[in-house]
Interface confidence: medium
């Protein structure tokens, strides 16, 4: 009997998607590349449930972790790597006083119980996301 695995080895399944939490650190742009190399995308968050799940993963491991969000194109206008804008309800995920753009902080990370903006050239952990494989048929 063949078992269906919706996600690759060492990836985590959640609500129809697969997530890879890195064990090494890269800058934000290299994190994008790392995800593309495995057929995924630096994580774009689409729902409150997904945010809660990812925040928990990040805070449990006590790691600062890149997500696919930046205001590199236009200061103060936060945009996901898939081109979609940051929804108004998602602004509540920023930590107190963030984003503060201290010293050109243009990329978003999971930090503690919320989000922080930090310098994109800093090496951090990252999370990739891709659709889970279908197990029907």
């Amino acid at each position: 009997e063949r078992l269906c695995h919706p996600c690759p080895w060492e990836w985590t399944f959640f609500q129809g998607n697969c997530y890879f939490m890195s064990n090494s650190q890269r800058n934000w742009h290299d994190s994008i590349t790392a995800c593309q190399e495995v057929g995924a995308q630096l994580v774009v968050i689409k729902s409150a449930e997904e945010q809660n799940f990812l925040q928990l993963q990040s805070s449990r491991s006590n790691r600062f972790t890149w997500m696919g969000l930046s205001d590199l194109n236009h200061e103060g206008t936060w945009q996901w790597v898939d081109g979609s804008p940051l929804l108004p309800s998602f602004k509540q995920y920023w930590n107190k006083g963030e984003p503060n753009n201290v010293g050109e902080e243009d990329c978003a990370e999971f930090s503690g119980n919320g989000w922080n903006d930090d310098k994109c050239n800093l090496a951090k952990f990252w999370i990739c996301k891709k659709s889970a494989a279908s197990c029907s048929g």
């Epitope: 509540q92 920023w94 006083g97 919320g114």
Partner: antibody, heavy 122, light 106 residues
Framework: QVTLRESGPALVKPTQTLTLTCTFS??????????VSWIRQPPGKALEWLAL???????YYSTSLKTRLTISKDTSKNQVVLTMTNMDPVDTATYYC??????????????WGRGTLVTVSS | DIQLTQSPSTLSASVGDRVTITCRAS??????LAWYQQKPGKAPKLLIY???SLESGVPSRFTGSGSGTEFTLTISSLQPDDFATYYC????????FGQGTKVEIK
């Protein structure tokens, strides 16, 4: 001490434009994460959210009323202004302004003004 | 728009009673829900945020629970000061309030 206070006319005529001012102290609307909202409550009825303005000047409006509403801020005066056009007797309500705090726990309203009653009548 | 439905609309209770108010959302709002208390002629007062977090200064007899679409506010032992109207409010997508639950003296 954080306070918010609403001011504006107690009586407006139908078809007129209502202008309400929220004057606040104890916080700054230039602080990241801070927002100010307007919420109304017709006599004996439920609360209804109208509009919100963020620290970064993003503005959000109630779907059903957005064509009639404009929200703006004057950070230097610590004021938020709401204008509502084409007033009707059904707009008679107590109008509140409220603050949304900074932080990653969400955009709820932690502090409210006392409210100002606006009656629409000819 | 997300709709919130509170039940019951009115609740008659006595001092010392355990009181539960329910708030149902028309779609999932995760835990982005707040509860407010309002007394006649006064502004609403925040009790609970993020579904279960107690606002500073609010008595511990108030507890919130739930996630997704179903939420409850419980008052463990009703006090004379608790007779009021209670509103739930979601902030997952824009902002909407429930229609309110009036807690009155039996």
């Amino acid at each position: 001490q954080v306070t918010l206070r609403e001011s504006g006319p107690a009586l407006v005529k139908p078809t007129q434009t209502l202008t309400l001012t929220c004057t606040f102290s104890g916080f700054s609307l230039s602080t990241s994460g801070i927002s100010v909202s307007w919420i109304r409550q017709p006599p004996g009825k439920a609360l209804e959210w109208l509009a919100l303005i963020d620290w970064d000047d993003d503005k959000y409006y109630s779907t059903s009323l957005k064509t009639r509403l404009t929200i703006s801020k004057d950070t230097s005066k610590n004021q938020v202004v709401l204008t509502m056009t084409n007033m009707d007797p059904v707009d008679t309500a107590t109008y509140y302004c409220a603050r949304t705090p900074s932080g990653s726990y969400g955009r709820y309203f932690d502090l409210w003004g006392r409210g100002t009653l606006v009656t629409v009548s000819s | 728009d997300i709709q919130l439905t509170q039940s019951p609309s009115t609740l008659s209770a006595s001092v010392g009673d355990r009181v539960t108010i329910t708030c149902r959302a028309s779609q999932s709002i995760s835990n982005w829900l707040a509860w407010y208390q309002q007394k006649p002629g006064k502004a609403p007062k925040l009790l609970i945020y993020k579904a279960s977090s107690l606002e500073s200064g609010v008595p511990s007899r108030f507890t919130g629970s739930g996630s997704g679409t179903e939420f409850t506010l419980t008052i463990s032992s009703l006090q004379p000061d608790d007779f009021a109207t209670y509103y739930c409010q979601q902030y997952n997508s824009y902002w909407t309030f429930g229609q309110g639950t009036k807690v009155e003296i039996k």
